[in-house]
Amino acid sequence: MKVLQEPTCVSDYMSISTCEWKMNGPTNCSTELRLLYQLVFLLSEAHTCIPENNGGAGCVCHLLMDDVVSADNYTLDLWAGQQLLWKGSFKPSEHVKPRAPGNLTVHTNVSDTLLLTWSNPYPPDNYLYNHLTYAVNIWSENDPADFRIYNVTYLEPSLRIAASTLKSGISYRARVRAWAQCYNTTWSEWSPSTKWHNSYREPFEQH
């Protein structure tokens, strides 16, 4: 049994880091493998993660962490029984993938303005809470070419757009994702999408 693709890990900079790797053949990850992880610090504790299957030869492990600070560094040991398959380290602050925003809502009752709001996925006491910016994706269910991205570079989790910038009388969907420049994070996963019917009053034209 060998590791084909070494573990790569990302942290949500809150309580979970996710590590993925591939074995050289079909593997029952949860029964055959264990990923041990330990904070490199005085009197730290070794923890064991039981991986799950992620495709035939792929494994994924969710490492629980009580808290994350920028100096944290973890040792990682991948074991198959008594055999050490791989040894590495992981610094969560250097591999951050934020949590996905939630509760995306489209408010259509504001005079020909669409107000999209969502929730910041972090509690106020988390460092990332005040450092997230967002991308909102809006697309038409009828027209695949009608696909747009709005970058929200301010901290407020909301976006206002004129309803008239979208076509009237058709359904749209929206989703949102987040990233934090301070830690040069990757983008989060997209939030679940929300759907609405876009309709607005055409301006009265005088002839």
């Epitope: 330990q38 610090f41 005085l42 009197l43 730290s44 504790e45 009580d66």
Partner: antibody, heavy 119, light 107 residues
């Protein structure tokens, strides 16, 4: 809410030993470290050392090696510190303080145990 | 050992004031700087850990900042219950060491 309950005040004679206790109201004692801190008017706060109750690992301030011995009883969520060969310099308030395992900040503190060394 | 210096041993301020308490380390401590509050009855509580992280249950009027060797604790809107002695502590290098404390009183 985590609470640490320390044993009561001690009046001991020079040359004797004293053993104080600290009981933690936590679910999994092994996920924490128990540290001990000395406070005197002259020296202020001094870190004595810490213990991982799960595996028994200890770390001591060199100044207190040979003076303090840290132990724990996992079954009762209780940590102990024994001080030996006591002198008047050991008269102080001693605090137990809990950290999450491998952390450098004392998240919860006991109320303190006053030790008075006097003939 | 790393020396932690709190140059102000005591200070007096009025209710509602913004108060800043400083702490200097004798060498770089890489943000491993924590702040504690000791009430007159001896009760000790963690306020801020790792320079600027607010411990759970601590009012948001407390904040911390700094880097390298210089750190500070700020109380933005002083209340009567903040009367206490405040200690800094470094957790970067063994042995972990504390500052001498700053006693805060109300004018």
């Amino acid at each position: 809410q985590v609470q640490l309950q320390e044993s009561g005040a001690e009046l001991v004679k020079p040359g004797a030993s004293v053993k104080m206790s600290c009981k933690a109201s936590v679910n999994t004692f092994t996920g924490y470290n128990m540290h001990w801190v000395k406070q005197t008017p002259g020296q202020g706060l001094e870190w004595i050392g810490g213990l991982h109750p799960g595996n028994g690992d200890t770390s001591y301030n060199q100044k207190f090696k040979g003076k303090a011995t840290l132990t724990a009883d996992k079954s009762s969520n209780t940590a102990y510190m024994q001080l030996s060969s006591l002198t008047s310099e050991d008269s102080a308030v001693y605090y137990c303080a809990l950290t999450t395992a491998g952390r450098a900040w004392f998240a919860y503190w006991g109320q303190g145990t006053l030790v008075t060394v006097s003939a | 050992d790393i020396q932690m210096t709190q140059t102000t041993s005591s200070l007096s301020a009025s209710l509602g004031d913004r108060v800043t308490i400083s702490c200097r380390a004798s060498q770089d401590i890489s943000n491993y700087l924590n702040w504690y509050q000791q009430k007159p009855d001896g009760t000790v509580k963690l306020l801020i850990y790792y320079t600027s992280r607010l411990h759970s249950g601590v009012p948001s009027r407390f904040s911390g900042s700094g880097s390298g060797t210089d750190y500070s604790l700020t109380i933005s809107n002083l209340e009567q219950e903040d009367v206490a002695t405040y200690f800094c502590q470094q957790g970067n290098t063994l042995p972990w060491t504390f500052g001498g404390g700053t006693k805060l009183e109300i004018k």
